[in-house]
């Protein structure tokens, strides 16, 4: 008789999930020799231990603590780039500006980027059929709790000037319900962080509006100011040119506004 399986609303665990996590760990430690002390098999065991045999709507940050401990990593606290709804450009930027780091440039962020995973209560199986959706099923699911945990720790580690890339093409440029708006903003430490600088990325070629005046950016400024952190905002009118100028800052066209 086939066992009854909970049917969730979200996609199931990414295929080859264990192999992918282990492979990513090896690749990461290969090109980040400062992380060579990490035992990738232990990392996978800790990752697995966070969600296997547990109800996928009852995951806590404590479940991920063994993994967090193994993945402890020091990044320059004044070189942190946060992002919201504009991941690809943020990653293209840190690929060029190698001294700056997004969460996905750290081991733990890299391991989980774009992956989905969940288990089942009381069985050691990984659920490849479906996993809980944050909205339709539950918020305390393995993926959401993981990103909440690592995002909080990443924000807590930040110091001096912290940058955030925001998508100017969206109706809510700053969204209080995003990971940035609900987790990272509230875990920046005012005693360490002097300024949050927002980079609002324009989508349209002819879009010359000052999106730093957008009501949601004003809302972000208000939240940040109440936390005794300075706020500044820049429009990035031409993201393609912006990246090109990061690559070649001496280019004569890079003195004008981008």
């Amino acid at each position: 008789v086939p066992r009854w399986r909970q049917q969730w609303s979200g996609p199931g665990t990414t295929k080859r999930f264990p192999e992918t996590v282990l492979a990513r760990c090896v690749k990461y430690t290969e090109i980040h020799p400062e992380m060579r002390h990490v035992d990738c098999q232990s990392v996978w065991d800790a990752f697995k231990g966070a969600f296997i045999s547990k109800h996928p709507c009852n995951i806590t940050e404590e479940d991920y603590q063994p993994l967090m401990k193994l993945g402890t990593q020091t990044v320059p606290c004044n070189k942190i780039l946060l992002w919201s709804r504009i991941k690809d450009l943020a990653h293209q930027f840190t690929q060029v500006q190698r001294d700056m780091f997004t969460l996905e440039d750290t081991l733990l962020g890299y391991l989980a980027d774009d992956l989905t995973w969940c288990g089942e209560f009381n069985t050691s199986k990984i659920n490849y059929q479906s996993c809980p959706d944050w909205r339709k099923d539950c918020s305390n699911n393995p993926v959401s709790v993981f990103w909440k945990t690592v995002s909080r720790r990443f924000a807590e580690a930040a110091c001096d000037v912290v940058h955030v890339m925001l998508n100017g093409s969206r109706s809510k440029i700053f969204d209080k319900n995003s990971t940035f708006g609900s987790v990272e903003v509230h875990n920046l430490q005012p005693e360490k962080v002097q300024t949050l600088e927002a980079w609002v990325i324009h989508g349209g070629r002819e879009d010359s509006r000052d999106l730093c005046q957008d009501p949601t950016i004003k809302e972000l400024e208000s939240i940040i100011s109440k936390r005794n952190i300075q706020f500044s905002c820049k429009n990035i009118y031409r993201p393609d040119k912006f990246l090109q100028c990061v690559k070649n800052p001496e280019d004569s066209s890079c003195t004008s506004e981008i």
């Epitope: 090896v26 690749k27 290969e30 090109i31 020799p33 060579r36 990653h91 690929q95």
Partner: antibody, heavy 118, light 112 residues
Framework: EVQLQQSGPELEKPGASVKISCKAS????????MNWVKQSNGKSLEWIGN????????TYNQKFKGKATLTVDKSSSTAYMQLRSLTSEDSAVYYC???????????WGQGTLVTVSA | DIVMTQAAFSNPVTLGTSASISCRSS???????????LYWYLQKPGQSPQLLIY???NLASGVPDRFSSSGSGTDFTLRISRVEAEDVGVYYC?????????FGGGTKLEIK
């Protein structure tokens, strides 16, 4: 069986660009970094850089920044290296090499000879 | 960059006897995790290089146990206990403790 099949020899003029390929088979392409190594005229080996096929992240030897560009096409499990502004110094055999679990270059392509001559 | 130094040629050896090839690094290749990130490759005439030894002393898959390697953090030796004709080629040491990864100049094994 793991295989890395590289494209054929190239003869290019100074100032031109060349793009050589390395088609991987016999393993999950995104699971390992792909490296590129230069061997000039029977001399020693120089590591150019590597690429993570999973998301395209690259790491370069500073010496080859601006000279080499590494890319991948996940759909065909192929890694590419483009060399620009070719000079006679770029005449060499170029190898692709797949890293292994303990980081050594476990599998190598057969090499692609690039000759730069006016 | 870490510089790997090798003699261009080995002392000529007779088939069936042992041979040693040396390599020196400009910096210790011993990581705080206890692993020494030193590798040995052999390039036979007309072929691509092949991995012989990884992490200083581990034999790569398919490599005969006539090959062994030892060393400190900066001085390393590859030993071939009973040299065979098929061992002829250039032996390269390499490090991947630090970027950029670097190779030695190679040592050509000479047969008497």
């Amino acid at each position: 069986e793991v295989q890395l099949q590289q494209s054929g020899p190239e003869l290019e003029k100074p100032g031109a660009s060349v793009k050589i390929s390395c088609k991987a088979s016999g393993y999950s392409f995104t699971d390992y970094n792909m490296n590129w190594v230069k061997q000039s005229n029977g001399k020693s080996l120089e590591w150019i850089g590597n690429i993570d096929p999973d998301y395209g992240g690259t790491t370069y030897n500073q010496k080859f920044k601006g000279k080499a560009t590494l890319t991948v096409d996940k759909s065909s499990s192929t890694a590419y290296m483009q060399l620009r502004s070719l000079t006679s110094e770029d005449s060499a055999v170029y190898y692709c090499a797949r890293s292994g679990y303990r980081y050594g270059f476990v599998y190598w392509g057969q090499g692609t000879l690039v000759t730069v001559s006016a | 960059d870490i510089v790997m130094t090798q003699a261009a040629f080995s002392n000529p050896v007779t088939l069936g006897t042992s041979a040693s090839i040396s390599c020196r690094s400009s910096k210790s290749l011993l990581h705080s995790n206890g692993i020494t990130y030193l590798y040995w490759y052999l390039q036979k005439p007309g072929q691509s290089p092949q991995l012989l030894i990884y992490q200083m002393s581990n034999l790569a898959s398919g490599v005969p146990d006539r090959f062994s390697s030892s060393g400190s953090g900066t001085d390393f030796t590859l030993r071939i206990s009973r040299v065979e004709a098929e061992d002829v080629g250039v032996y390269y040491c390499a490090q991947n403790l630090e970027l950029p990864w670097t190779f030695g100049g190679g040592t050509k094994l000479e047969i008497k």
